[in-house]
């Protein structure tokens, strides 16, 4: 049978060849011709056998971390017969470990975040080194961790690489720390190899600082002309914390919050003082308010840092503004009857200087030839008014300070021209009608209606009559329909075109005004040859002919 011991070859041997051991058949008594052969991966290149003796040599430097064992096959042949002396057999050459690899931190870079003010013992991060050497070969891969940099704030557990806090840290003093960890193999014994890694430990912020005003007194000014909502200045508190822990809310103490307000700009963390109600220099020219500032987010466990809010005093000076005149009313509406004589009284407007010096006021009416205004604000007519031309005047009254003509105020003035009955009713249109020669008595010739340009307080009511002459001339008559219309009827039978081709009837129309006005209106009636039918409708053709200037026989 085969005779061999287990084969070991140390890695990283520097000699050209290293004797590993001997393969031998127990039939080989040294007095026969046995040839030993080596087969398999590495045979002839990494491992060489002296075929005469069975001695195996490693002729290459081996790296256990690259390959830790080689499985080879052995043969032995009797060269006298050419036959195998023993069955081919597999054997193993193990590469034994030396401590030729230092520990390496494979997960670099290491970065950890831990809240500031964390108590001692708080776990920060675990670093792990890896050693390529054989963990089963002595202490070659047994590691010990130690801290090279980072005392007294951090410590590392020697066997686990767990980094813990060993002293409280304040982010506001230093916000990040570089810790250097060393890993040594051979459990730190002489001849150990080492590797280091750097760990960046960042302190995250906790809300352990309250905001504090930069100034104990702020002086601001506001113009009395400033509208509500105007920003009149900013105040600023500072907070050593960062992010949402530095977000703050400004407010005014309750008693001072009538005229002013403070809103917080959450981007700049400034307090913006806002005008809540308009100020009047003449009424009150300075204010004092107290503002306070608090953090927006404060967890319960950190309330101890925020017991008393920081406050500041804000003195606000109101700046006097030369204000324009102020009318007593926002607008004026006056009434005046039409046809009143020039210089008639319309109404009085009044404006005053709100400033302390009480400048006299001058008035003017813009772009009006119809009205005048004097320095007392009295408005009079400068022309006669006709409601039927203009029933309303939309005007603008301007008040100007005498001592500062740039200070101007304008308000609307509405003047309504009231109606008087100064127009008689008249035909609503021009009437021209026709009567047939053979018309009978009582035949309706025309319906007429009237209009009146005057405005009626009640409804208009018109009265229709024939003039005295036409009443005496009995060819036509009128009937008032009592609905502001009337009808003209024939008052006889038969008309003669040759003798009397046209009738001009004067119609009187009276209104119901006080006093009543009457107008005379002429109705033209043509006599037509209507044929046998006797209907006025047949006059339409002749109306056309007549209107074209043809003479009909």
């Amino acid at each position: 049978g085969w005779v061999w011991n287990q084969f070991f070859v140390p890695e990283e041997m520097n000699t050209t060849s290293h004797h590993i051991g001997q393969l031998r058949s127990d039939l080989d008594n040294g007095n026969n011709s046995f040839q030993y052969k080596l087969l398999g991966a590495g045979a002839g290149s990494t491992f060489i056998i002296d075929e005469r003796t069975g001695d195996i040599y490693a002729i290459q430097k081996l790296d256990r971390e690259e390959r830790s064992l080689y499985i080879l096959r052995a043969q032995v042949i009797d060269i006298a017969t050419g036959r195998a002396v023993e069955p081919e057999s597999e054997f193993v050459i193990k590469v034994s470990d030396i401590n030729d690899n230092e520990p390496k931190f494979l997960d670099e870079p290491y970065e950890a975040i831990v809240p500031e003010m964390s108590p001692e013992g708080t776990l920060v991060i675990q670093v792990t080194a890896s050693d390529a050497d054989d963990p089963s070969s002595g202490n070659n891969a047994r590691l010990l961790y130690s801290l090279l940099q980072g005392q007294p704030y951090f410590s590392v557990e020697p066997t686990t690489g767990v980094i813990r806090i060993s002293s409280k840290m304040d982010r506001e003093l230093q916000d990040e720390y570089w810790v250097i960890i060393q890993a040594k193999d051979m459990i730190g014994q002489p001849g150990a190899l080492s590797g280091t890694t750097s760990v960046l430990i960042k302190l995250s912020d906790v809300n352990d600082n309250k905001p504090i005003f930069k100034e104990s007194l702020y002086r601001l000014t506001v113009s009395e002309s400033a509208p509500t909502g105007t920003s009149i200045g900013t105040i600023m508190a500072y907070d050593n914390d960062i992010g949402e822990n530095a977000e703050m809310d400004y407010s005014i103490e309750e008693d001072d919050s009538q005229t002013f307000d403070i809103i917080t700009n959450h981007e700049t963390q400034e307090g913006i003082v806002i005008l809540k109600k308009k100020v009047d220099f003449e009424h009150q020219n300075h204010y004092g308010i107290r503002a306070k500032v608090k953090n927006h987010h404060v967890p319960e466990q950190l309330m101890k840092y925020h017991t008393e809010a920081s406050t500041t005093f804000i003195k606000i000076q109101v700046e006097d503004v030369d204000e324009p005149p102020l009318f007593l009313l926002p607008y004026y509406v006056f009434e005046v009857f039409e046809e009143t004589p020039q210089g008639s009284f319309v109404g009085v407007v009044s404006a005053t200087d709100p400033d302390n010096r009480k400048s006299p006021i001058r008035y003017s009416i813009t772009r009006s030839k119809v009205f005048n205004i004097n320095d007392n604000g009295t408005i009079t007519t400068s022309n006669s008014l006709d409601r039927e031309i203009s029933a309303w005047y939309n005007l603008s009254i301007t008040a100007t300070e005498k001592y500062n003509i740039e200070q101007i105020s304008s308000i609307p003035l509405y003047v309504q021209v009231l109606n008087i009955n100064d127009h008689a009713p008249e035909f609503s249109q021009y009437y021209e009608t026709y009567v047939c020669e053979n018309a009978g008595s009582g035949q309706v010739i025309q319906t007429i209606s009237a209009v009146d340009r005057d405005e009626s307080i009640e409804e208009h009511h018109f009265y229709f009559n024939l003039s005295v002459e036409d009443t005496n001339n009995s060819s036509f008559t009128i009937i008032d329909n009592q609905d502001n219309t009337a009808v003209i009827l024939t008052n006889r039978t038969g008309f003669n075109l040759q003798e009397e081709p046209v009738f001009y009837i004067s119609i009187l129309i009276a209104d119901n005004g006080i006093p009543s006005l009457t107008s005379t209106n002429t109705l033209t009636i043509h006599v037509c040859d209507c044929g046998d039918s006797g209907s006025t409708q047949t006059c339409q053709y002749q109306e056309l002919v007549l209107s074209m200037g043809f003479k009909t026989e």
């Epitope: 050209t16 060849s17 004797h19 040294g30 007095n31 026969n32 011709s33 040839q35 052969k37 060489i48 002296d50 075929e51 005469r52 003796t53 001695d55 040599y57 002729i59 060269i79 006298a80």
Partner: antibody
Framework: QVQLQESGPGLVKPSETLSLTCTVS????????WSWIRQPPGKGLEWIGY???????NYNPSLKSRVTISVDTSKNQFSLKLSSVTAADTALYYC????????????????WGQGTMVTVSS | DIVLTQSPGTLSLSPGERATLSCRAS???????LAWYQQKPGQAPRLLIY???SRATGIPDRFSGSGSGTDFTLTISRLEPEDFAVYYC?????????FGQGTRLEMK
């Protein structure tokens, strides 16, 4: 072509160690077996032993206790040490290369050095 | 050890003649691992035949080897003047390698 050259002291005192070196030129020492052979004056040839380039050795049992053969592949040299010499070790010492006619087993010596004479005398 | 005995000890022949040298082993030489060498005065031995019958590189074909087991022969078919020297047989079939005591071939 490959040439062998023996070198070493020509005179060695009895009981001392004879040391010779064979330098291989014109080829590599690797993959061959290298032998030392001696020839006492007027006598025949005697094989002393061989070394394989990897360092494996085999010696003539008659000299085994006194012989050490070593190799230095980086210098392309191999050496012979024969301890406790006597006058009987006076001889012409040859280094020789085994041919590779028959791979792996012993083979004939196809290349020889010209030999170096070593005299053991006080 | 295998002992090789060469005969004759000295062989006197003239150029052009045929020379036959014998080598007998004390036990069978495995695989016919037997070689013949020529040595001239002041020179190192020169390989002539290996494997009992194979000529080494550059050896004239007048040299030939034969035999197996325990009996081996070196034949020089037609002697040339430069062939007169000492001839050694060597077995390398078993360790240790051994040489015969030599045959001196001299000119008659």
């Amino acid at each position: 072509q490959v040439q062998l050259q023996e070198s070493g002291p020509g005179l060695v005192k009895p009981s001392e160690t004879l040391s010779l070196t064979c330098t291989v030129s014109g080829g590599s020492i690797s993959s061959y077996y290298w032998s030392w052979i001696r020839q006492p004056p007027g006598k025949g040839l005697e094989w002393i032993g061989y070394i394989y380039y990897i360092g494996s050795t085999n010696y003539n049992p008659s000299l085994k206790s006194r012989v050490t053969i070593s190799v230095d592949t980086s210098k392309n040299q191999f050496s012979l040490k024969l301890s406790s010499v006597t006058a009987a070790d006076t001889a012409l010492y040859y280094c020789a290369r085994e041919s590779r006619y028959r791979s792996g087993w012993y083979d004939a010596f196809d290349i020889w050095g010209q030999g170096t004479m070593v005299t053991v005398s006080s | 050890d295998i002992v090789l005995t060469q005969s004759p000890g000295t062989l006197s022949l003239s150029p052009g003649e045929r020379a036959t040298l014998s080598c007998r082993a004390s036990q069978s030489v495995a695989g016919s691992y037997l070689a013949w060498y020529q040595q001239k005065p002041g020179q190192a031995p020169r390989l002539l035949i290996y494997g009992a019958s194979s000529r080494a590189t550059g050896i004239p074909d007048r040299f030939s080897g034969s035999g197996s087991g325990t009996d081996f022969t070196l034949t020089i078919s037609r002697l040339e003047p430069e062939d007169f020297a000492v001839y050694y047989c060597q077995q390398y079939g078993k360790s240790p390698i051994t040489f015969g005591q030599g045959t001196r071939l001299e000119m008659k």
